[in-house]
């Protein structure tokens, strides 16, 4: 006769492991008992369980409640056992010793491999600001057994670097994603993808990029110079910019206080019916936590009763 077993049995942490040991004997042969033991190198064999044809299953105190026979129907030549709720410490070499009649004793070894699926974590890097050089956007760490694979899925252009740390029964892998921040990256997803044989599907953690920036400011409203004449109603100046975080707007007049009746509404400066007193240099000040910008315009309100022509100068400054 001969023993049938597996070279390697692989289970995921927490699952039940079937340790196979089947005696394929000639007709009339019987199995008296099957003894299972840990057989790791450097340690004496530690009995796990003994499956006796007459006295039943005996289990070592160290494995009490964790070793069982497979459910019926059972073949008397089958010495397989179930190891419930596999833990990392169960990983290693196992030996089954089968005592048969009249052929004698047989033994076989198998290796139990316990996969420990990773629990990945993603840590964003420092605040991203336009104008920075190559900067850490995020790092992703996953620890498991065997070592997991950590990659990135994104439309954003960047570079990755990985390092791993081996522990006694597992390995931790950390991958970093570096990029040169630009405003076009704002709101873009950066996804860490972790693969592992103990996972049914890849684990994905997504981080949304936030890049601080502030665009140049400009003022709209003076495109048609002929509209800025005494008596005109509804005249307004609008300050244009964009940023992350969204900027705030402030209006001032360079050559004096804002004339009475001029309304500030965020990015918009609203004028009452125009008079020549509204002529002057107006400054839009745009700011967020990242930066600030200024844009100034010169308003000349034309009085049709005067011969002089109207002039408008547009100046932008940062």
């Amino acid at each position: 006769g001969e023993l049938e077993t597996s070279d390697v049995v692989t289970v995921v942490l927490g699952q039940d492991a079937k340790l196979p040991c089947f005696y394929r004997g000639d007709s009339g042969e019987q199995v008296g008992q099957v003894a299972w033991a840990r057989a790791d190198a450097g340690e004496g064999a530690q009995e796990l369980a003994l499956l006796h044809s007459k006295y039943g299953l005996h289990v070592s105190p160290a494995y009490e409640g964790r070793v069982e026979q497979p459910p019926p129907p059972r073949n008397p030549l089958d010495g397989s056992v179930l190891l419930r709720n596999a833990v990392q410490a169960d990983e290693g070499e196992y030996e089954c010793r089968v005592s048969t009649f009249p052929a004698g004793s047989f033994q076989a070894r198998l290796r139990l491999r316990v996969l420990v699926p990773p629990l990945p974590s993603l840590n964003p890097g420092p605040a991203l600001e336009e104008g920075q050089g190559l900067t850490l956007a995020a790092s992703c760490t996953a620890e498991g057994s065997p070592a997991p694979s950590v990659t990135w899925d994104t439309e954003v252009k960047g570079t990755t670097s990985s390092r791993s740390f081996k522990h006694s029964r597992s390995a931790a892998v950390t991958s970093e994603f570096h990029l040169v921040p630009s405003r076009s990256m704002n709101g873009q997803p950066l996804t860490c993808v972790v693969s592992h044989p103990g996972l049914l599907q890849d684990q994905r953690i997504t981080h949304i990029l936030h890049v601080s920036f502030l665009a140049e400011a400009s003022v709209r409203g003076l495109e048609d110079q002929n509209l800025w004449h005494v008596g005109r109603e509804g005249a307004m100046l609008k300050c244009l910019s964009e940023g992350q975080p969204p900027p705030s707007y402030n209006w001032t007049r360079l050559d004096g206080p804002l004339p009475s009746g001029v309304r500030v509404d965020g990015d918009t400066l609203g004028f009452p019916p125009l008079t020549t007193e509204h002529s002057g240099i107006y400054v839009c000040h745009v700011s967020n936590e990242f930066s600030s910008r200024d844009s100034q315009v010169t308003v000349d309100v034309l009085d049709p009763q005067e011969d002089s022509g109207k002039q408008v100068d547009l100046v932008s400054a940062s």
Partner: nanobody, 117 residues
């Protein structure tokens, strides 16, 4: 041949405890399986507990959580600690030893355990 000598039986009230001992005439470390059967009047003999040379143990479902089996290699003795005894535990308790796998077991003479309600 292995001689087995039991002791520790007796009369006890329900909820009480007893400790049975089984001393073997040869090293229990080399005995494949040792343990205890019991036989109540008019019933079949049933396996109560067993312990292997490698230290693995078996307890019948009816006694799990109440009985424990242990072995002292230095004294060549196997013990059955019986706690929370019930009237249905009343029986003659026999020590057995299978010296070599497949051989007929050696038996002790039996010790009476009586649990009164």
């Amino acid at each position: 041949e292995v001689q087995l000598v039991e002791s520790g039986g007796g009369l006890v009230q329900a909820g009480g405890f007893l400790r049975l001992s089984c001393a073997a005439s040869r090293s229990v470390f080399r005995i494949n399986v040792m343990g205890w059967y019991r036989q109540a009047p008019g019933k079949q003999r049933e396996l109560v507990a067993g312990i292997t040379s490698g230290g693995s143990r078996r307890l019948a479902d009816s006694v799990k959580g109440r009985f424990t089996i242990s072995r002292d290699n230095a004294k060549n003795t196997v013990y059955l600690q019986m706690n929370s005894l019930k009237p249905e535990d009343t029986a003659v308790y026999y020590c057995f030893a299978e010296a070599v796998v497949g051989d007929e077991p050696y038996w002790g003479q039996g010790t009476q355990v009586t649990v009164s309600s």
